[in-house]
Interface confidence: low
């Protein structure tokens, strides 16, 4: 129903803690280079007005959209062109235009520092200090990290590191309690970050309807017993919390997906029984539980999907009637049967039967025409199985490091004119996939392998479509979502490319690596390794393995050393003449 | 490198049966699905049966209920089973593995239906 003040309808329904949370994400997404304090004041001005509102629906300026708000908010900070360049642009334009110029502008690989974690006594002291503020840090950092975070997620996510410090602060040994658990947050927040980038990028690029199809094929995989007029309702719904978190509208995404959750758990007969344990928690831990529960049990009854989809005389005419219908039928059929499959595999093969419906309804005798479009899915089906299969088997005989940097040679050769720290960060990310995944039982490791390296490719295309350098990435990056893993999956090596002349300097190392953390170290062997790869970009597996492992050889003695620096003076160049060797 | 050897096919009349059979060699056979096809002079290859790694099968819609498709990972063979056989069933069949990752098909063995 339509509100007096859209600001105080918000501010009702989320309470003050939630609206005060989503409005500093937003803000922080909004403009990525502005302090906490400044967004602090921000928001504070924003909610003391919201307050106004709720006093008095008629008050001055209560009857205006959020994005006039927000809008006329952010465009009255001090220095905005010196600071944000262009995008104070944005700020001549009029609603809805405006909006709009702010989402185009927000930066995926904004430069700022990566987010350092204080050490525990510093952390708990100042978390006891101001519990409030502290926990503000945490959503503006994160957020203006990661510009399309989903909010309420996010707000979930608050909530657990909030916990965490409450309970390990309280601890003698603060630092052996809060690490692992921060770790498991970060590592959970990273990947629900890339998942919901993909999701806007489908949004943005391919339109509500692609979105809602990605929707249909995970719903109907997690609730095979629910209908497909059920399953259309929960898609549509959730499509539209999406859209509007990937436009910045965060007051309405968190309210219409609380709305959503609370729909669910009213509903649990028709949708699934493995709601209740999620239904019991408070809303921020039901709404996420419920995004990731497991799959209910399939019905033992399902009919061969052939059936409807083949083997009935009127499939041309359901299809012509109806065609998305039909295809949505399809993909929820097909999917409740398959919770073993990937989202990106089930459109695939949605989209399989769509071009082979438009074809062959053309034809004189369609039936046999149609007829072999499930033995047609196979080689689309096999694909990736065996892709899951070759690096599961990789990963378990490498371990995660060395798999990253198989992942890292193969990239390198594969698109050798992206960026050394992109590719690296690719690299790692992708290599990830085998902790995540390939430890899972059998039907649980492709959905998992694959969905989770689309998110992880989307992410190189965001980055490679700020400066194209590789007409292979150019290429993936170009075609739908669902095919681009495949895509990059069958690049080979870039015949193009012209390889990189040998630098001494990028292989010149200085004792102060010795004292970084691991994951630095590995990050500045892995930039090493690409940098080879670009030199030689037909180099063999055992020629870079000669040269990592004696890389990695000179590190721990140099690193041993009494004296140090002279051991990396003298040894390093040693190093860079065997290098040359090896490669030669 | 990888090979395929097709064998079974020959001359038999209508409503009459054979056993084809095809051994893989040169690539890890149980974790593809295999494919058997059917050439006619002057047409397109076309998918008779498929079977997955894990031995689920699919069918063509003239081969439905009449044709079995079934395999062995320890002797890396596929089989085809074909019953009650019509002159349109006629054509080299061949099988090969259902994979992008490399393209590769046999020989072919020749049935003709026949009266």
């Known amino acids: 129903e339509a509100h007096k003040s859209e600001i105080a309808h918000r501010y009702n329904d989320l309470g003050e803690q939630h609206f005060k949370g989503l409005v500093l994400i937003a803000f922080s997404q909004y403009l990525q280079k502005c302090s906490y304090d400044e967004h602090a004041k921000l928001v504070q001005e924003v909610t003391d007005f919201a307050k106004t509102c709720v006093a008095d629906e008629s008050a001055a300026n209560c009857d205006k959209s959020l994005h006039t708000l927000f809008g006329d908010k952010l465009c009255a900070i001090p220095n905005l062109r010196e600071n944000y360049g262009e995008l104070a642009d944005c700020c001549t334009k009029q609603e809805p235009e405006r909006n709009e110029c702010f989402l185009q502008h927000k930066d995926d690989n904004p430069s700022l520092p990566p987010f350092e974690r204080p050490e525990a006594e510093a952390m708990c002291t100042s978390f006891k200090e101001n519990p409030t503020t502290f926990m503000g840090h945490y959503l503006h950092e994160v957020a203006r990290r990661h510009p399309y975070f989903y909010a309420p997620e996010l707000l979930y996510y608050a909530e657990q590191y909030n916990e965490i410090l409450t309970q390990c602060c309280a601890e003698a040994d603060k630092e052996s309690c809060l690490t692992p658990k921060l770790d498991g947050v970060k590592e959970k927040a990273l990947v629900s970050s890339v998942r919901q980038r993909m999701k806007c990028s489908s949004m943005q690029k391919f339109g509500e309807r692609a979105f809602k199809a990605w929707a249909v094929a995970r719903l109907s995989q997690t609730f095979p017993n629910a209908d497909f007029a059920e399953i259309t309702k929960l898609a549509t719904d959730l499509t539209k919390v999406n859209k509007e978190c990937c436009h910045g509208d965060l007051l309405e995404c968190a309210d219409d997906r609380a709305e959503l959750a609370k729909y669910m758990c009213e509903n649990q007969a028709t949708i699934s029984s493995k709601l209740q344990t999620c239904c019991d928690k408070p809303l921020l831990k039901k709404a996420h539980c419920l995004s990731e529960v497991e799959h209910d049990t399939m019905p033992a009854d399902l009919p061969a999907i052939a059936a409807d989809f083949v083997e009935d005389q009127e499939v041309c005419k359901n299809y012509a009637e109806a065609k998305d219908v039909f295809l949505g039928t399809f993909l929820y059929e097909y999917s409740r049967r398959h919770p073993d499959y990937s989202v990106s595999l089930l459109l695939r093969l949605a989209k399989k039967y769509e071009a082979t419906l438009e074809k062959c309804c053309a034809e004189a005798n369609p039936p046999a025409c149609y007829g072999t479009v499930l033995a047609e899915f196979q080689p689309l089906v096999e694909e990736p199985k065996n892709l899951v299969k070759t690096n599961c088997d990789l990963y378990e005989k490498l371990g995660e490091y060395g798999f990253q940097n198989a992942i890292l040679v193969r990239y390198t050769q594969k698109a050798p004119q992206v960026s050394t720290p992109t590719l690296v960060e690719a690299a790692r990310n992708l290599g990830r996939v085998g902790t995540k995944c390939c430890t899972l039982p059998e039907d649980q490791r492709l959905p998992c392998v694959e969905d989770y390296l689309s998110a992880i490719l989307n992410r190189v295309c965001l980055l490679h479509e700020k400066t194209p350098v590789s007409e292979h990435v150019t290429k993936c990056c170009s075609g739908s979502l669902v095919e681009r893993r495949p895509c990059f999956s069958a690049l080979t090596v870039d015949e193009t490319y012209v390889p990189k002349e040998f630098k001494a300097e990028t292989f010149t190392f200085h004792s102060d690596i010795c004292t970084l953390p691991e994951k630095e170290k590995q990050i500045k062997k892995q930039t090493a390794l690409a940098e080879l790869v670009k030199h030689k970009p037909k180099a063999t597996a055992e020629q870079l393995k000669t040269v990592m492992d004696d890389f990695a050889q000179f590190l721990d003695t140099c690193c041993k050393a009494a004296d140090k620096d002279t051991c990396f003076s003298t040894e390093g160049p040693n190093l860079v003449t065997r290098c040359k060797d090896a490669l030669a | 490198q990888v090979q395929l050897q097709e064998s079974g096919g020959g001359l038999v009349q209508p409503g009459g049966s054979l056993r084809l059979s095809c051994k893989a060699s040169?690539?890890?056979?149980?974790?593809?699905?295999m494919g058997w096809y059917r050439q006619v002079p002057g047409k397109e290859r076309e998918a008779v049966a498929t079977?997955?790694?894990?031995?689920?099968?699919f069918y063509a819609n003239s081969a439905s209920g009449r044709f079995t498709i079934s395999r062995d990972n320890a002797k890396s063979t596929v089989y085809l089973q074909m019953n009650n056989l019509k002159p349109e069933d006629t054509g080299v069949y061949s099988c090969?593995?259902?994979?992008?990752?490399?393209?590769?098909q046999g020989q072919g063995t020749q049935v003709t239906v026949s009266s």
């Open positions: 090969s593995p259902i994979t992008s990752i490399f393209k590769a």
């Open positions: 040169g690539f890890t056979f149980s974790i593809y699905s």
């Open positions: 079977i997955s790694s894990g031995g689920s099968p």
